[in-house]
C-alpha cells in the first residue's frame, strides 16, 4: 500500500513549472511549497493543470493566508479565481483597477456569477465610491451590472459607459433606474440620425418624459408594443390619440391586445371615445361624447 | 481490520430520495478519499464522485445536481444523497477507499460489499 | 475524458497469456489502475500507476502504458483469474461521465 505523506525525495518543487504536471495530488500538496507558490502565482495560468489539482494549489494558499489573500496574489490568480467560493473572495481587500480587470477578464463571456458579483462588492467597498474609471470597467464586462445599482450610485455614470449597453441588460432596470439611465442615453447618442437614434435609445425609453414620447411620434419611428408597455404610465397619459397612432404606426393595432393592461389600459379611459373610435379597433372605456373633461391636476396647481 | 459496510439500499419510488451510508472501521476515514461507484445488473462500473480529506467533492457529470456526496469524521461515515430517482438508478452502491490519505491519485484499494437500490413503482 | 477497453470480452484457457488493453481521449500520465471483479463481489484493485502492483496480487499481473495507451497482462492465466477487468483513469474527476472502461470479461475458451 502507497502510504506517503511526506515529499518523496527530489520532487521538492524548486519553482512553479511545467513538470507539476505529472505530479499527483498529494504530491503537489506535499512537495510544492505554498510561499513559492505566492510568489509565482502568475506561472500558474499557463501550466496545463487539471481542477483537481487547482484545488489542491487553492487548499496550498488557503492555509497561508487563511484571513485573505493579499492583492499581491489575487491579481496574479488567472483560473484560479473559478475556484474561489464567495467566502473566499469576501476576506480580499481589493483597491487595484488591474486587479479587478484581471479577474474579470478570466470570467469574460460568461453570466455574472455570485463570485464576480463578491468581488464587485468587495473593490467598491474598498475604494469607498464609484468613480468614472471602475464605472467604465463594470459596463464594460457587465452592461448588466447597471441595474444592479442604486439610482444614487448610478448618477455617477458617464453617458460614454451607456454605448456598450444591450437591450437584454436593462430588462432588470426598474423604472427609478431608467429615470436616472434614460437622459445620460439621450445625451450619448444625441448626435445620431432618426432611426439609429430610436434603436439606440429604445430600451432605455422606460425613464422618457412625454414630450420626448411626443418629439419620436413625430418621427415615424414605428414603435413596438413590447416597448411601449414598457413606458412611464405618467408619461403616455397625456399623449393624444394621434400621437400614440405615430408612434405605433403599423403597430397600433397590438393595442386591442393590451387594452386590459397599463399603460393602454389608463391612457384609453383618458381619451374621448370619438378619438379612439377614428384607430378602427374596438377599443372601448374612452370618455363618451358631450362629457366635460376637468383636468384636476392643473386645477390643484392653479389654486 | 479494514472494512466498509453500506446501508440504507432498498425499494424506492421513481422521484423519491434515499440516503446511503458507509461506516468505515480499522482505520481514520477523515484521512482518506473516499468514493461512490455504482453498478446496474448485468453493467459495467459507473462512477459517481467522491469526496477528499478536505472535503472537497467531485461527481460524474450525469450525477451533478441530484447525488451529494458527505462524510462524518466524527461517525467515520461518508454518505451518498440521491434525489429525483429514476428506474435507471437502480444498482448495486458500493462505497469505496482510496489507496492513500488526501485525493484520488492511485485508485480504490479498499470496497465495501455494496448495498442494491431499486428504483421502482 | 473517455475510457475505451478492448476487447469487451476473451475466451482463453488456463496456462495462456492474457492481454487487455485501454485507451484514453486524452493524456493522462500514469494515472491509471486497473480492477478485477467476479460476480457477486466487490472489484479488486490490481493495479495502480500503471504498473504497480497492489498488495497481495500475484506476480503474473503485470501493467504497463503511460500517455494514452496501456496495458494489462496476465502471464499465466489461472482459473481464479476468470472474471471482468475494469481500467479506471484518475488523473481528472472533474466534469467527466466515467472513468472506468467498459470492462474486459475473460472466461474459459
Known amino acids: 500500500e502507497v502510504e506517503k505523506t511526506a515529499c518523496p525525495s527530489g520532487k521538492k518543487a524548486r519553482e512553479i513549472d511545467e513538470s507539476l504536471i505529472f505530479y499527483k495530488k498529494w504530491e503537489l500538496e506535499a512537495c510544492v511549497d505554498a510561499a513559492l507558490l505566492a510568489t509565482q502565482m502568475d506561472r500558474v495560468n499557463a501550466i496545463p493543470f487539471t481542477y483537481e489539482q487547482l484545488d489542491v494549489l487553492k487548499h496550498k494558499l488557503d492555509e497561508l493566508y487563511p484571513q485573505g489573500y493579499p492583492e499581491s496574489v489575487i491579481q496574479h490568480l488567472g483560473y484560479l479565481f473559478l475556484k474561489m467560493s464567495p467566502e473566499d473572495i469576501r476576506k480580499w481587500n481589493v483597491t487595484s483597477l488591474e486587479t479587478l480587470k484581471a479577474l474579470l477578464e478570466v470570467n469574460k463571456g460568461h453570466e455574472m456569477s455570485p463570485q464576480v458579483a463578491t468581488l464587485i462588492d468587495r473593490f467598491v467597498k474598498g475604494r469607498g465610491q464609484l468613480d468614472k474609471d471602475t464605472l467604465d470597467t463594470l459596463t464594460a464586462f457587465y452592461p448588466g451590472y447597471l441595474c444592479s445599482l442604486s439610482p444614487e450610485e448610478l448618477s455617477s455614470v458617464p453617458p460614454s459607459s451607456i454605448w456598450a449597453v444591450r437591450p437584454q441588460d436593462l430588462d432588470t432596470c426598474d423604472p427609478r433606474q431608467l429615470d436616472v439611465l434614460y437622459p445620460k442615453a439621450r445625451l450619448a447618442f444625441q448626435n445620431m440620425n432618426g432611426s439609429e437614434y430610436f434603436v439606440k435609445i429604445q430600451s432605455f425609453l422606460g425613464g422618457a418624459p412625454t414630450e420626448d414620447l411626443k418629439a419620436l411620434s413625430q418621427q415615424n419611428v414605428s414603435m413596438d408594443l413590447a416597448t411601449f408597455m414598457k413606458l412611464r404610465t405618467d408619461a403616455v397619459l397625456p399623449l393624444t390619440v394621434a400621437e400614440v397612432q405615430k408612434l405605433l404606426g403599423p403597430h397600433v393595432e397590438g393595442l386591442k391586445a393590451e387594452e386590459r393592461h397599463r399603460p393602454v389600459r389608463d391612457w384609453i379611459l383618458r381619451q374621448r371615445q370619438d378619438d379612439l373610435d377614428t384607430l378602427g379597433l374596438g377599443l372601448q372605456g374612452g370618455i363618451p361624447n358631450g362629457y366635460l373633461v376637468l383636468d384636476l391636476s392643473m386645477q390643484e396647481a392653479l389654486s | 481490520q479494514v472494512q466498509l459496510v453500506e446501508s440504507g439500499g432498498g425499494l424506492v419510488q421513481p422521484g423519491g430520495s434515499l440516503r446511503l451510508s458507509c461506516a468505515a472501521s480499522?482505520?481514520?476515514?477523515?484521512?482518506?478519499?473516499m468514493g461512490w461507484v455504482r453498478q446496474a445488473p448485468g453493467k459495467g462500473l459507473e462512477w459517481i464522485g467522491y469526496i477528499s480529506t478536505i472535503a472537497n467533492t467531485y461527481y460524474a457529470s450525469w450525477a451533478k445536481g441530484r447525488f451529494t456526496i458527505s462524510r462524518d469524521n466524527s461517525k467515520n461515515t461518508v454518505y451518498l444523497q440521491m434525489n429525483s430517482l429514476r428506474a435507471e438508478d437502480t444498482a448495486v452502491y458500493y462505497c469505496?477507499?482510496?489507496?492513500?490519505?488526501?485525493?484520488?491519485?492511485?485508485?480504490?484499494?479498499?470496497w465495501g460489499q455494496g448495498t442494491l437500490v431499486t428504483v421502482s413503482s | 475524458i473517455q475510457m475505451t477497453q478492448s476487447p469487451s470480452s476473451l475466451s482463453a484457457s488456463v496456462g495462456d497469456r492474457v492481454t487487455i488493453t485501454c485507451q484514453a481521449s486524452?493524456?493522462?500520465?500514469?494515472?491509471l489502475a486497473w480492477y478485477q471483479q467476479k460476480p457477486g463481489k466487490a472489484p479488486k484493485l490490481l493495479i495502480y500507476?500503471?504498473?504497480d502492483l497492489a498488495s497481495g496480487v500475484p506476480s503474473r499481473f503485470s501493467g504497463s502504458g503511460s500517455g494514452t495507451d496501456f496495458t494489462l497482462t496476465i502471464s499465466s492465466l489461472q482459473p481464479e483469474d476468470f472474471a471482468t477487468y475494469y481500467c479506471q483513469q484518475v488523473r481528472s474527476s472533474s466534469d467527466i461521465d466515467n472513468p472506468f472502461g467498459t470492462g474486459t470479461k475473460v472466461t474459459v475458451l
Open positions: 480499522g482505520f481514520s476515514l477523515s484521512s482518506y478519499a
Open positions: 469505496a477507499r482510496e489507496i492513500r490519505s488526501g485525493w484520488v491519485d492511485y485508485g480504490f484499494s479498499i
Open positions: 500507476d500503471a504498473s
Open positions: 486524452q493524456n493522462i500520465y500514469s494515472n
